[in-house]
């Protein structure tokens, strides 16, 4: 998902030239210190180099742009705004550059940025106004077509006194700049539920990554409004089953498939209506792959193998019944 | 923008096996599905069948299921229809399109079977 | 399968026209109706999908509404590239299926 470039030919910018021209307006096309640059392929890389800031000099032809493994730490309202601007910026990957914070605008001045990469940053502090620059209620239309989101939680004690998901979806939803979003990756983010009225927003959203998470239910998420969901990856999460209504609404995108593998499914009385729908449904990649976590009696039974007679729930006990 | 480039127009036997290729550029926005369409001359547009490409997953029109066969090579982002037993009311171009709502589509490819 | 019922099958309008063509489905597919647009020797082109969402790029005079099984394709002032012949499409139910299309020509 992260930019990627077939350039074969790169010039280096040796450290020292920085200095020589840093008093002068950079020259149009020059490539930045740190940096490699291929005006063929349109592509500029600057990574692994410990750069504490986006540099100033980028040439003005660059559309594939890797500012991978720095120390960026923050990224400020207009980090990329240029004179003339970055018109044909349309990737830029930022994974891994130590980033803690992201501030309102960031990104904004950037017409054609289709996909963004901020993963493997540490984001303590997300901007609601990242993504749509502004505070208005209703934004100019981000360009953004895809947006990966893996592994930005930062550690438990950097975290503000705050939900991080509620941080994230302030950040995804205002303004509604983010209308147009096809592709959503927000795997290995310990996201412990996901908010009910972020699906209803993104409604052009093709591909959602949540893997890698902890989500134990999707009983108050609705997937009716992602009419054109192609992918759901909802492997490596917390989920013990999968209720009707879940079941009805995924039965119902008819471009879906859903990826459901390594969840530690609850194989009782709960688990019926599931069973029974992956027996019928075609949209589960690899569904004879699911098999039940619990109970115990149940562990690594394949689901599609089960049979209402396998699937009982304990009797609670009346209180007057039960021992201490 | 996504681009979808077909093989050139075939002349088949009837008979004879036929199989079109579609290579798929500008992946990054590109849908997983990829279906096929046949346009007979002169005549209106018939689903045949689709593929998702990371999975292999298919899905046949019943109507040429058992002569129809849609794989993907994903490291060359390509997707191909095969069509077997040929004959002469198979004579059409065939389209894929790329999305579930095959927003974009390949050029064509003209078929012909005759003996 | 679901049957798809395009009418007009022909269509004679002047430049500046408002153009409308129906399509009916044999059952209910909900929204799941496209628009395709495909002019003599050439590809198909997504014009509207969803019953009313306009692909990107697509001119605005292009806008389609229904829901259930009755569906509406209007061109609101018909220009002369849009001579074509025009499709409709259901993707609700496994096989797909199009309708007959209406071919569209300048008076």
């Known amino acids: 998902s992260s930019p990627t470039s077939s350039a074969s030919s790169f010039s280096s910018s040796a450290p020292f030239l920085a200095s020589a021209v840093s008093a002068q307006p950079p020259l149009p096309d020059q490539c930045p210190a740190l940096c490699e640059c291929s005006e063929a392929a349109r592509t500029v890389k600057c990574v692994n180099r410990n750069l504490t800031e986006v540099p100033t000099d980028l040439p003005a032809y660059v559309r594939n742009l890797f500012l991978t493994g720095n120390q960026l730490a923050v990224l400020p309202a207009g980090a990329f705004a240029r004179r003339p601007p970055l018109a044909e910026l349309a990737a830029l990957n930022l994974s891994g550059s130590r980033l803690d914070e992201v501030r309102a605008g960031a990104f904004e001045h950037l017409p054609s940025l289709r996909q963004l990469d901020l993963s493997h940053n540490p984001l303590a502090d997300l901007s609601p106004f990242a993504f749509s620059g502004s505070n208005a209620s209703v934004s100019a239309p981000s360009p953004l077509v895809e947006l990966i989101l893996n592994h930005i939680v930062p550690p438990e004690d950097e975290r503000q006194n705050r939900s991080f998901e509620g941080m994230v979806v302030a950040a995804l939803l205002a303004g509604r700049a983010l209308q147009g979003l096809r592709r959503l990756e927000l795997a290995s983010n310990h996201f412990l539920y996901l908010p009910r009225d972020v699906l209803a927003q993104l409604p052009s959203l093709r591909h959602l990554d949540l893997s890698n998470n902890s989500l134990v239910s999707l009983t108050y998420v609705s997937f009716r409004n992602l009419t054109h969901l192609e992918s759901l990856h909802l492997e490596d999460n917390a989920l013990k089953v999968l209720h009707n209504g879940t079941l009805a609404e995924l039965q119902g995108l008819p471009h879906i498939r859903v990826f459901l593998d390594n969840n530690p499914w609850v194989c009782d009385c709960h688990m019926a209506d599931m069973v029974t729908w992956l027996k019928e449904t075609e949209v589960v990649q690899g569904k004879d792959r699911l098999t039940c976590a619990y109970p115990e009696k149940m562990r690594n039974r394949v689901l599609l193998e089960l049979n209402s007679a396998d699937l009982d729930c304990d009797p609670i006990l009346p209180p007057s019944l039960q021992t201490s | 923008e996504v681009q979808l480039v077909q093989s050139g127009a075939e002349v088949k036997k009837p008979g004879a096996t036929v199989k079109i290729s579609c290579k798929v550029s500008?992946?990054?926005?590109?849908?997983?599905?990829m279906n096929w369409v046949q346009q007979a001359p002169g005549k209106g547009l018939e689903w045949i069948g689709r593929i998702y490409r990371e999975d292999g997953h298919t899905n046949y029109n019943g109507k040429f299921k058992g002569r129809v066969t849609i794989t993907a090579d994903t490291s060359t982002d390509t997707a191909y229809m095969e069509l077997s037993s040929l004959r002469s009311e198979d004579t059409a171009v065939y389209f894929c399109a790329n999305g579930g709502a095959m927003d974009y589509w390949g050029q064509g490819t003209l078929v012909t079977v005759s003996s | 399968d679901i049957q798809m019922t395009q009418s007009p099958s022909s269509l004679s309008a002047s430049v500046g026209d408002r153009v409308t063509i129906t399509c009916r489905a044999s059952?209910?597919?909900?929204?799941?109706l496209n628009w395709y647009q495909q002019k003599p020797g050439k590809a198909p082109k997504l014009l509207i999908y969803y019953t009313s969402r306009l692909h990107s790029g697509v001119p605005s005079r292009f806008s389609g509404s229904g829901s259930g099984t009755d569906f509406t394709f209007t061109i609101s002032s018909l220009q002369p590239e849009d001579i074509a012949t025009y499709y409709c499409q259901q993707d609700n139910t496994l096989p797909w299926t199009f309708g007959g299309g209406t071919k569209l020509e300048i008076k």
């Open positions: 500008g992946y990054a926005f590109s849908s997983s599905w």
């Open positions: 059952q209910d597919i909900s929204n799941y």
